[in-house]
C-alpha cells in the first residue's frame, strides 16, 4: 500500500520497490527501502505473527529464506505506515505451516499454511489420507494467511487436514493439521443426585454423589452447604470421564465420615458453564438415635364376615431399617410375619408398610392381632381387634318338662331370637309370640367369640295344632327351628 496524501498533510512513507506484493527467489537478496524524512522503523510480521524490527531504513536480507515471507511495514514519526507483502519463493517449501489448529464450534478456524509462491493453482484443503472432507465443510483460501474453515462443526473435531496446491501440474501438500474443536456451550450443565433426602443416625457416614454432565471439561462444579448462607465444601472426591468427544461427565462425591446432628441441612450440588448454572439439592437429617413411628391406623376395630378375607395394614417409619417384624394373635406369636415392603422406590426411604392377610376367616379366628416391629434403637406395636361376623346357628330347640319351649342360638353380632306361630294350613309363620325369658350366655373365653342367646316361650298358650318357629337373626343372616304341634308331638328343625 503506497502513500497518497493531500498537499500539506503528513504523508505515509514510500517503499521501494513501489508495489504491494513482491516475489523474491529463495537464496536471493531481499532489499526494501523506506523513503521518509521522519522514518522510524521497519517491522516484519512473520507467518506465525511474531514481529521483527529493523531501525535502518534499508531492509536488506541476503540469502532470503522462505520463512521471510510476510508483511513488511515501514512507519514514520507521525504514526503513518506503508506495507509491502513479500513472497520468498522456495521450491522445497511451498507452505509456511503454523501449528497447531484450534477452532470453536460455529466460528471460523484458520489453517495457517500461507504460500511462499502466489503463482500456484488450486490452493485448497484436503483430508490427510485422501478421504473426502465432510460434505458440509467449506473453506476459503488466502495465500497470505492460510485457509479458513468456515462455521466449524463439532463433527470436525480431530479432523486431519493438509493444505494443497498445484505447481506446474504437480500436487504439493503441507504438513498435517488436526483440528481441535472447542464446543460452543449452548446449554447449562446437567446436574443430578440419586436421592433428594437422607436420614442418618449420629456417627453414621453420609455419602452423596453428584453427577455433572456437559460438553466440556471447563464446567465448574462444587458442593455447597446451605446454612443459610452457601458454604463451599472442600473435602470432595472427584472422578471424571470422557464418554465421547463432547460428552464429559464428572462425579463429585461428598462424604461426612461421622455425621453429627448439626450436620443436618440442605446440601447443594452446583455447576456452571458459560451458558448458565444448574443445581440440585439433597437434604440430610441426622438424628441422635433411631426411631420407629407407627402411623395412626384409621380403625383398629375390624369387623369381617365369616369366610371372607381381611387385610390388616400398618404403615410406619423406621430408621435404621426394621430388623424384626412379627404378628401376635391373642398374645401368642403367629407363624405369619405378614408381608413387609418399602412404601416408595426412593433408596433412602424410611416408610414401610406391613400387611397381614387373613383369608377365609372362621368365627373362631376373631381376636387381637398385634403387629410388633423393632430395630436396633426402638420398638413399637399396634393392635387390631378383629370381630368375625357369623350367621346365627341354632344350637338347641327343646320342649322342657315345665312345658316351656326353649331355643338356644349363637352368632356374632348377638343374635335376636323371635318366635312365631302358624296353623298347619299357613305356608309361613307370621304371628309373633312374645318370649317369656331371654338370656345372653357369655360362654366364650374371649370377648371376640360368638355370643349365645337363650330364649323361651310358654307352650301352654297354644290351643291349636300348628307350628312354632324359633327364628335367630343378626346382620349376617338368619336361622330357624320349628316345633310342630299335633296329636303325636314331634319336633323337627329347618335351617
Amino acid at each position: 500500500s503506497q502513500p497518497s496524501a493531500s498537499p500539506g498533510e503528513p504523508s505515509p512513507p514510500s517503499i521501494h520497490p513501489a508495489q504491494s506484493e513482491l516475489i523474491v527467489e529463495a537464496g536471493d537478496t531481499l532489499s526494501l527501502t523506506c523513503i521518509d524524512p521522519d522514518f522510524v522503523r521497519w517491522t516484519f510480521k512473520t507467518y506465525f505473527n511474531e514481529m521483527v524490527e529493523n531501525k535502518k531504513n534499508e531492509w536488506i536480507q541476503e540469502k532470503a529464506e522462505a520463512t521471510r515471507t510476510g508483511t513488511y511495514t515501514c512507519s514514520n514519526s507521525n504514526g503513518l505506515t506503508s506495507s509491502i507483502y513479500v513472497f520468498v519463493r522456495d521450491p522445497a517449501k511451498l507452505f509456511l505451516v503454523g501449528l497447531p489448529l484450534f477452532g470453536k464450534e460455529d466460528s471460523d478456524a484458520l489453517v495457517r499454511c500461507p504460500l511462499t509462491d502466489p503463482q500456484v493453482s488450486n490452493y485448497s484443503l484436503i483430508e490427510c489420507d485422501g478421504k473426502s472432507l465432510p460434505t458440509d465443510l467449506t473453506f476459503v483460501p488466502n495465500p497470505k494467511a492460510g485457509i479458513t474453515i468456515k462455521n466449524v462443526k463439532r463433527a470436525y473435531h480431530r479432523l486431519c487436514v493438509r493444505c494443497a496446491a498445484q505447481r506446474d501440474g504437480t500436487w504439493l501438500h503441507s504438513d498435517k493439521f488436526t483440528l481441535k474443536v472447542r464446543a460452543a456451550i449452548k446449554a447449562i450443565p446437567v446436574v443430578s443426585v440419586p436421592e433428594t433426602s437422607h436420614l442418618l443416625k449420629k456417627g453414621d457416614t453420609f455419602t452423596v454423589v453428584c453427577t455433572i454432565k456437559d460438553v466440556s471439561t471447563s464446567v465448574n462444579s462444587m458442593w455447597l452447604k446451605m446454612n443459610p448462607q452457601p458454604q463451599h465444601i472442600a473435602q470432595v472426591k472427584h472422578n471424571s470421564w470422557h464418554r465421547g468427544d463432547f460428552n464429559y461427565e464428572r462425579q463429585e462425591t461428598l462424604t461426612i465420615s461421622s455425621a453429627r446432628v448439626d450436620d443436618s441441612g440442605v446440601f447443594m450440588c452446583y455447576a456452571n458453564n458459560t451458558f448458565g448454572s444448574a443445581n440440585v439439592t439433597t437434604t440430610l437429617k441426622v438424628v441422635e438415635k433411631g426411631f420407629i413411628n407407627i402411623s395412626p391406623v384409621k380403625n383398629t376395630t375390624v369387623f369381617v364376615t365369616d369366610g371372607e378375607n381381611v387385610d390388616l395394614v400398618v404403615e410406619y417409619e423406621a430408621y435404621p431399617k426394621p430388623e424384626h417384624q412379627q404378628w401376635i394373635y391373642m398374645n401368642r406369636t403367629s407363624a405369619n410375619k405378614g408381608k413387609d415392603y418399602v412404601k416408595s422406590d426412593n433408596k433412602s426411604n424410611i416408610r414401610y408398610v406391613n400387611q397381614l392377610r387373613l383369608t377365609r376367616l372362621k368365627g373362631t379366628e376373631g381376636g387381637t392381632y398385634t403387629f410388633l416391629v423393632s430395630n436396633s434403637d426402638a420398638s413399637a406395636s399396634v393392635t387390631f381387634n378383629v370381630y368375625v361376623n357369623t350367621k346365627p346357628e341354632i344350637l338347641t330347640y327343646d320342649r322342657l318338662i315345665n312345658g316351656m319351649l326353649q331355643c338356644v342360638a349363637e352368632g356374632f353380632p348377638e343374635p335376636t331370637i323371635d318366635w312365631y306361630f302358624c296353623t298347619g294350613a299357613e305356608q309361613r309363620c307370621t304371628t309373633p309370640v312374645s318370649p317369656v325369658d331371654v338370656q345372653v350366655q357369655n360362654v366364650s373365653v374371649s370377648p371376640f367369640g360368638k355370643l349365645v342367646v337363650q330364649s323361651s316361650i310358654d307352650s301352654s298358650v297354644f290351643r291349636h295344632n300348628g307350628t312354632v318357629e324359633c327364628k335367630a337373626s343378626n346382620d349376617v343372616g338368619k336361622s330357624s327351628a320349628f316345633f310342630n304341634f299335633a296329636f303325636k308331638e314331634q319336633i323337627q328343625a329347618h335351617t
Epitope: 501449528l99 498435517k176 488436526t178 481441535k180 471447563s218 471424571s240 470422557h242
Partner: antibody, heavy 118, light 111 residues
Framework: QVQLVESGGGVVQPGRSLRLSCAAS????????MHWVRQAPGKGLEWVAV????????DYTDSVRGRFTISRDNSKNTLYLQMNSLRAEDTAVYYC???????????WGQGTTVTVSS | DIVMTQSPLSLPVTPGEPASISCRSS???????????LDWYLQKPGQSPQLLIY???NRASGVPDRFSGSGSGTDFTLKISRVEAEDVGVYYC????????FGQGTRLEIK
C-alpha cells in the same frame, strides 16, 4: 532456541501453597495447548492438567481438581500451576509440556521439584 | 479413565539385539478420524521424557529409524530393531484419546 523452563518448586508443608511457572521461548507460545505432568520419586509419569492455547478450556486429573489451577499469560509466554492445599502425595518433579498437532507432547521442560513434607 | 498396561516392566537387552515393548489399553484408542491416539516416550536417566512415536506409528522428528511403533485399537508395540547403549531408560506409552494416562513404564537396560 526452542525451550521450556520450569521454576517455583521447593519444600513446603502439607496444606500450604506453591506456584510453579514455565517460561516458553523460541516458538509462538500463544498457539499451543500446554500441560503439566508430574513424576513422584521412583515412580512413573502422571498427567496433571491441560490448558488450551487461549486459556478457555482447562482440565485436571481427579486427584488435584479443586486444589490446583492451571493458567497462562500469553503476553509473557508463561504457563502457571497454582497448587493449594498441598499433600504429601503431591511430592514430585513437575514438568511442563507442549502439545503438538497430534496431541502428543513434543517438547518438555527440565522439571522442577516439589516436596511436601512436615 | 483408560488404563494403560505395559509389559515387560523390565527389559535387559544385548546391544545390537532387537527389543519389543507391549502396551495394552482398557479401551480402543482408535478415533473416528482413523488415528490411534497412542504415543511412546523415552525418559533417559536424569532427563526429561522425549517423544519417540505419535499417533501409534509415526516417528517424531529426530528419532532414529531403528524405532518403530505399530498396533491399533487396544494393542500396541514399540520395537527397537537394534538396541544401542544410548537407548537405555524408561519407555512409557501414553493415550491421548481421553483424559491422558500413561503406562507404568518399561525399564530397558543393557545386559
Amino acid at each position: 532456541q526452542v525451550q521450556l523452563v520450569e521454576s517455583g518448586g521447593g519444600v513446603v508443608q502439607p496444606g500450604r501453597s506453591l506456584r510453579l511457572s514455565c517460561a516458553a521461548s523460541g516458538f509462538t507460545f500463544s498457539r499451543y495447548g500446554m500441560h503439566w505432568v508430574r513424576q513422584a520419586p521412583g515412580k512413573g509419569l502422571e498427567w496433571v492438567a491441560v490448558i488450551w492455547y487461549d486459556g478457555t478450556n482447562k482440565d485436571y486429573t481427579d486427584s488435584v481438581r479443586g486444589r490446583f489451577t492451571i493458567s497462562r499469560d500469553n503476553s509473557k509466554n508463561t504457563l502457571y500451576l497454582q497448587m493449594n492445599s498441598l499433600r504429601a502425595e503431591d511430592t514430585a518433579v513437575y514438568y511442563c509440556a507442549r502439545e503438538d498437532w497430534a496431541e502428543a507432547f513434543d517438547m518438555w521442560g527440565q522439571g522442577t521439584t516439589v516436596t511436601v513434607s512436615s | 479413565d483408560i488404563v494403560m498396561t505395559q509389559s515387560p516392566l523390565s527389559l535387559p537387552v544385548t546391544p545390537g539385539e532387537p527389543a519389543s515393548i507391549s502396551c495394552r489399553s482398557s479401551q480402543s484408542l482408535l478415533h473416528s478420524n482413523g488415528y490411534n491416539y497412542l504415543d511412546w516416550y523415552l525418559q533417559k536417566p536424569g532427563q526429561s521424557p522425549q517423544l519417540l512415536i505419535y499417533l501409534g506409528s509415526n516417528r517424531a522428528s529426530g528419532v532414529p529409524d531403528r524405532f518403530s511403533g505399530s498396533g491399533s485399537g487396544t494393542d500396541f508395540t514399540l520395537k527397537i530393531s537394534r538396541v544401542e547403549a544410548e537407548d537405555v531408560g524408561v519407555y512409557y506409552c501414553m493415550q491421548a484419546l481421553q483424559t491422558i494416562t500413561f503406562g507404568q513404564g518399561t525399564r530397558l537396560e543393557i545386559k
